[in-house]
């Protein structure tokens, strides 16, 4: 991929002292896995586990590796050209409105509904009407009104194991 | 699978030019940083500069940036290496060499090399 | 430049033996490390890369350690295959520089 980030695509705090003009889009750049040098004559590598860059740029730093949360898995490590990828333990979920944590996925559906989904990483389980098939807020229940999975049920990849 | 198969050996007089082909096969040409490297008789191994195909950035060492340029033809899925103004000290073994992953630079795949030698 | 400065530059061996050849760094290269092989008349043959890390095909009895400025290639026990000259190399920075070779021969 010979996608570029330069360093007009950071935020201004980001950004090094301004490059003299470059008379093609790549003159000037280093690899994926390497930052510019400060008198940007040469690349340096990023530091394997602990920086990061995945794109032809002029960055004059890598980028630090995403460190996994307790309550997360470490599906594939960082390297020089990309980042740690994370994901939620199983039984927990990250919601795209709520992204910096890994919430735990219901145990069961409200009363009159029937479950349609199971817990994965990026969702909750999910759960439908009986009747008219139509979708769950998603609001977790009272424990009382919860209907668990019936003992002849396949247990959910979320089940908790308590 | 990979292979790199370099132009042959080449005699040139001392202020000419010289130019080396490497064609590539076995991968996709244009995703992978393409090296020259060269070795003086009996002497070690010199980087002399990158190429990548991918977006045609070069990378050339300072020694060499004012007598190299580095071109490619995709269309054959070739490089080349060209060095001016040629001297006596010139005369080594020409390797082209392609990085084992992607974008780290440690070379996997080598040429079989080209002698070129430069004398009067 | 970053100069790297590889020791011995010849080396006596015999078949069997455990062999260490050095390299030193003129500044940190982050485990950025490669070690080659290469025979007379042939092109270099990469061994190691990020200092630990065996290349595909290569014989376990080959191994790579190190950090900061100081990298080690060791092969636990020499086979008749094994006498060739080795190169380290830096790959942390432009422009890659390698070490001026060991020479491993038959004792």
């Known amino acids: 991929e010979s996608a570029l980030i330069t360093q007009q695509d950071l935020a201004p705090q980001q950004r090094a002292a301004p490059q003299q003009k470059r008379s093609s889009p790549s003159e000037g750049l280093c690899p994926p896995g390497h930052h510019i040098s400060e008198d940007g004559r040469d690349c340096i590598s990023c530091k394997y586990g602990q920086d990061y860059s995945t794109h032809w740029n002029d960055l004059l730093f890598c980028l630090r590796c995403t460190r996994c949360d307790s309550g997360e898995v470490e599906l594939s490590p960082c390297t020089t050209t990309r980042n740690t990828v994370c994901q939620c333990e199983e039984g927990t979920f990250r919601e795209e409105d709520s992204p910096e944590m890994c919430r735990k996925c219901r145990t069961g559906c409200p009363r009159g509904m029937v479950k349609v989904g199971d817990c994965t990483p990026w969702s909750d389980i999910e759960c439908v009407h009986k009747e008219s098939g139509t979708k769950h807020s998603g609001e977790v229940p009272a424990v009382e009104e919860t209907v668990t999975s019936s003992p002849g049920t396949p247990a959910s990849p979320c089940s908790l194991s308590g | 699978q990979v292979q790199l198969v370099q132009s042959g050996a080449e005699v040139k007089k001392p202020g000419a030019s010289v130019k080396v082909s490497c064609k590539a096969s076995g991968y996709t040409f244009t995703d992978y940083i393409i090296h020259w490297v060269r070795q003086a008789p009996g002497q070690g191994l010199e980087w002399i500069g990158w190429?990548?195909?991918?977006?045609?950035?070069?990378k050339s060492n300072e020694k060499f940036k004012d007598r190299v340029t580095l071109t490619a033809d995709t269309s054959t899925s070739t490089v080349y290496m060209e060095l001016s103004s040629l001297r006596s000290e010139d005369t080594a073994v020409y390797y082209c060499?392609?990085?084992?992953?992607?974008?780290?630079?440690?070379?996997?795949?080598w040429g079989q090399g080209t002698l070129v030698t430069v004398s009067s | 430049d970053i100069q790297m400065t590889q020791s011995p530059s010849s080396l006596s061996a015999s078949v069997g033996d455990r062999v260490t050849i050095t390299c030193k760094a003129s500044?940190?290269?982050?485990?950025?490390a490669a070690w080659y092989q290469q025979k007379p008349g042939k092109a270099p043959k990469l061994l190691i890369y990020?200092?630990?890390t065996r290349h595909t095909g290569v014989p376990s009895r080959f191994s790579g350690s190190g950090s900061g400025t100081d990298y080690t290639l060791t092969i636990s026990s020499l086979q008749p295959e094994d006498f060739a000259t080795y190169y380290c190399?830096?790959?942390?920075?432009?422009?890659?520089?390698f070490g001026q070779g060991t020479k491993l021969e038959i004792k």
């Open positions: 500044q940190d290269v982050n485990t950025a």
């Open positions: 190399q830096q790959h942390y920075s432009t422009p890659y520089t």
């Open positions: 060499a392609r990085n084992e992953d992607n974008y780290g630079n440690f070379f996997g795949y």
């Open positions: 990020w200092a630990s």
């Open positions: 190429f990548y195909p991918g977006n045609n950035n070069i």
